[in-house]
């Protein structure tokens, strides 16, 4: 005999919630695998600038995406299937996974906050290396793509410590179209924008993390309530 009333509502709520979660995981995993195997993006992600490889943050980034996507699909499946099948075992595993993920999120949040300066430094170093390579080797399309991505995403251009040649090449070729080279280079340069992202905009990342954490706690409560509901319904 299945669950009834409010517990039935929780069952379908948990199902829908986790189905969306499973789909999102699938999209992330798909994009990550595509990035990993597509020749153009592989060049971009494993960019070797001269004799300097891209910082470890970026090298590992793709695998983190793959792992996140896979875990999301797995946990989403557990929640989805566990709810629809009214399986205490699957829901218990789902709850355990959520507890582990919650702990990981807290740990990642603390690590990110503690190492934010190092991460920002890595990002700036990567930008500088890409910019240098784009100027020195004008055939380095992957380096140019990295530089243009930075410029368009952060709406910036160059940094305040540029060589004459780099300034000239940026002005004519790599700055976002219609941008003012003077203001871009000396007022809101990319180094400044990267620093802003990791300090001034840190609260946005914090808000996102809190939202995810609240959703996790909400799912933990729902899964426990449903688990108890299943246990109770099987008694009667």
């Amino acid at each position: 005999m299945g669950v009834e009333g409010c517990t039935k509502c929780i069952k379908y709520l948990l199902f829908v919630f986790n189905f969306v979660f499973w789909l999102a995981g699938g999209v992330i995993l798909g994009v990550a695998l595509w990035l990993r195997h597509d020749p153009q993006t592989t060049n971009l992600l494993y960019l070797e600038l001269g004799d300097k490889p891209a910082p470890n943050t970026f090298y590992v980034g793709i695998y983190i995406l793959i792992a996140v996507g896979a875990v999301m699909m797995f946990v989403g499946f557990l929640g989805c299937y566990g709810a629809i099948q009214e399986s205490q075992c699957l829901l218990g595993t789902f709850f355990t996974c959520l507890v582990i993920l919650f702990a990981c999120e807290v740990a990642a949040g603390i690590w990110g906050f503690v190492n934010k300066d190092q991460i920002a430094k890595d990002v700036k170093q990567f930008y500088d290396q890409a910019l240098q390579q784009a100027v020195v080797d004008d055939d380095a399309n992957n380096a140019k793509a990295v530089v243009k991505t930075f410029h368009e995403t952060l709406d910036c251009c160059g940094s305040s410590t540029l060589s004459a040649l780099t300034t000239s090449v940026l002005k004519n070729n790599l700055c976002p179209s219609g941008s003012n080279i003077i203001s871009n280079l000396f007022k809101e340069d990319c180094h400044q924008k990267i620093d802003d992202l990791f300090s001034g905009k840190l609260y946005l990342i914090g808000i996102a993390a809190i939202v995810v954490a609240v959703i996790m706690i909400f799912e933990m409560i729902l899964s426990m309530v449903l688990c108890c509901g299943i246990r109770n319904s099987s008694v009667y």
Epitope: S163, A164, L165, T167, K171, N173
Partner: antibody, heavy 119, light 112 residues
């Protein structure tokens, strides 16, 4: 030893055209930015144009923009400057120079070729 | 009128120390762009003398030295020799004009 040898200069009428060449040797030409710098009689040096190693990036001084075109042939280790719609004020000794990314300057120069624009 | 201002001429006797100044603005030397110095004997190829404000390429005697302060730079030649008689040009990059800029040149005469 780095060597840059300019040629193609001479006397030309206003409105005329001229093509300067610069033969390079003693270094990996295809890996270096190259530039043209000129010096009008009794005046100082004036940067004219540069070209990147694979010809992707070029830039010009405002005084020659739209009239001069810089190009290169890496297989021949040669730099060119095509000069059209020449004016009297373009009269100068034109120097070919290698641009060093590391030093961020013109580290080697040729001896120059004289271009005289006169009717 | 050059963007970078240099004295038209300078002179000194052998063994003396001579300084040539190069005055720019906040859009070139003052903007943080390096100043470089070239030696030019008429009819020959200009030669890089000082790069990055104060560095000497290999082969340039240590009698030549460069410095930079604010919007100005200077070239000092100590123990002046007759072969130092030439035109000297300073060079930088101007971010407002987006061009490489040179000084008007200083003609150095070694007297006696």
């Amino acid at each position: 030893e780095v060597q840059l040898l300019e040629s193609g200069g001479g006397l030309v009428q206003p409105g005329g055209s001229l093509r300067l060449s610069c033969a390079a040797s003693g270094f990996t030409f295809s890996s270096n930015y190259m530039s043209w710098v000129r010096q009008a009689p009794g005046k100082g040096l004036e940067w004219v144009s540069y070209i990147s190693s694979s010809s992707t990036y070029t830039d010009y001084a405002d005084s020659v923009k739209g009239r001069f075109t810089i190009s290169r042939d890496n297989s021949k280790n040669t730099l060119y400057l095509q000069m059209n719609s020449l004016r009297a004020e373009d009269t100068a000794v034109y120097y070919c120079a290698r641009y060093s990314y590391d030093r961020d300057n013109f580290d080697y120069w040729g001896q120059g070729t004289l271009v005289t624009v006169s009717s | 009128q050059s963007v970078l201002t240099q004295p038209f001429s300078a002179s000194g006797t052998p063994g003396q120390r001579v300084t040539i100044s190069c005055t720019g603005s906040t859009s070139n030397i003052g903007a943080g762009y390096d100043t470089h110095w070239y030696q030019h004997l008429p009819g020959t190829a200009p030669k890089l003398l000082i790069y990055g404000n104060s560095n000497r390429p290999s082969g340039v005697p240590d009698r030549f030295s460069g410095s930079k302060s604010g919007t100005s730079a200077s070239l000092a030649i100590s123990g002046l020799r007759s072969e130092d008689e030439a035109d000297y040009y300073c060079q930088s990059y101007d971010t407002n004009l987006s061009v490489w800029v040179f000084g008007g040149g200083t003609k150095l005469t070694v007297l006696g």
